[in-house]
């Protein structure tokens, strides 16, 4: 008799999830010599232990604590780049500007980027059929709790000037419900962070509006100012040129506004 299985509203665990996490860990430790000492089997065991045999709507930050310990890493606190709804450009930027870090440039972020996972209560099975959706099912699911945990810790670690890349093509350039708006903004430490600098990325080539005047950016400025952190904002009118100028800052066309 087949066992009844909970049907969730979200997609199931990414296929070959264990193999993917293990392979990513090995690759990361090969690329980053300072992480060569990491035992990837132990990392996978800790990752698995956070959600296997647990109800996928009852996951806590504490469940991920063993994984957090194994993911200990040096991140220059003044070189942190946060992002919201514009992940690809943020990652392209840090691939060029190698001394800056997004969360996905760390081991823990790299392991989980774009993956979905969940288990089932009282069985050691991974659920490849469906996983809880944050809105339709529950917020304390394995994926959401993981990203909330690492995002909170990443923001807590930041100091001096923190940069955030925001998508100027979206109706809400700053969205209070995004991970940046709901977690990272509130976990920047005012005693360590002097300024949050927003980079608003324009989508259209002919878009010359000052999106730093957008009401949602003003809302972000208000939230940040109330936390005793300074706020600044820059328009990135030409993201393609912006990246090109990060690669080749000496280029004569890079002295004008990007």
């Amino acid at each position: 008799v087949p066992r009844w299985r909970q049907q969730w509203s979200g997609p199931g665990t990414t296929k070959r999830f264990p193999e993917t996490v293990l392979a990513r860990c090995v690759k990361y430790t090969e690329i980053h010599p300072e992480m060569r000492h990491v035992d990837c089997q132990s990392v996978w065991d800790a990752f698995k232990g956070a959600f296997i045999s647990k109800h996928p709507c009852n996951i806590t930050e504490e469940d991920y604590q063993p994984l957090m310990k194994l993911g200990t890493q040096t991140v220059p606190c003044n070189k942190i780049l946060l992002w919201s709804r514009i992940k690809d450009l943020a990652h392209q930027f840090t691939q060029v500007q190698r001394d800056m870090f997004t969360l996905e440039d760390t081991l823990l972020g790299y392991l989980a980027d774009d993956l979905t996972w969940c288990g089932e209560f009282n069985t050691s099975k991974i659920n490849y059929q469906s996983c809880p959706d944050w809105r339709k099912d529950c917020s304390n699911n394995p994926v959401s709790v993981f990203w909330k945990t690492v995002s909170r810790r990443f923001a807590e670690a930041a100091c001096d000037v923190v940069h955030v890349m925001l998508n100027g093509s979206r109706s809400k350039i700053f969205d209070k419900n995004s991970t940046f708006g709901s977690v990272e903004v509130h976990n920047l430490q005012p005693e360590k962070v002097q300024t949050l600098e927003a980079w608003v990325i324009h989508g259209g080539r002919e878009d010359s509006r000052d999106l730093c005047q957008d009401p949602t950016i003003k809302e972000l400025e208000s939230i940040i100012s109330k936390r005793n952190i300074q706020f600044s904002c820059k328009n990135i009118y030409r993201p393609d040129k912006f990246l090109q100028c990060v690669k080749n800052p000496e280029d004569s066309s890079c002295t004008s506004e990007i």
Epitope: M68, T72, Q73, T74, V75, N78, V150, R153, Q189, E191
Partner: nanobody, 117 residues
């Protein structure tokens, strides 16, 4: 600006004890969890222990549990690590850092602990 200064390291024999100290300044000490991390020669950063801002909650790496004790004196902005039953594998530069990790940017020079017979 967060500043820390570690001290108390040295050369000891296996089984001996050491007490590391960390003087912190530039921030409201009680507002921050504090951690000890270490880096063995030729190895990466390893988390050792964390203590909450109030000092009421502590956590340890399995490799040091039962041998090391983290503590703090909030009136003096000081963090401590009492290390007993030291082993050769505890040889490392020890850093104190603000926060609970896993992302650390240590500000001090660290203090070298060498365990050798």
């Amino acid at each position: 600006e967060v500043q820390v200064l570690e001290s108390g390291g040295g050369l000891v024999q296996p089984g001996d004890s050491l007490r590391l100290s960390c003087a912190a300044s530039g921030f409201t000490f009680t507002n921050f969890a504090m951690s000890w991390v270490r880096q063995a020669p030729g190895k990466g950063l390893e988390w050792v222990s964390t203590i909450s801002g109030s000092g009421g909650s502590t956590d340890y790496a399995d490799s040091v549990k039962g041998r090391f004790t983290i503590s703090r004196d909030n009136s003096k902005n000081m963090l401590y690590l009492q290390m007993n039953s030291l082993r050769a594998e505890d040889t490392a530069v020890y850093y104190c850092a603000d926060g609970r990790g896993p992302f650390f940017d240590y500000r001090g020079q660290g203090t070298l602990v060498t365990v050798s017979s």
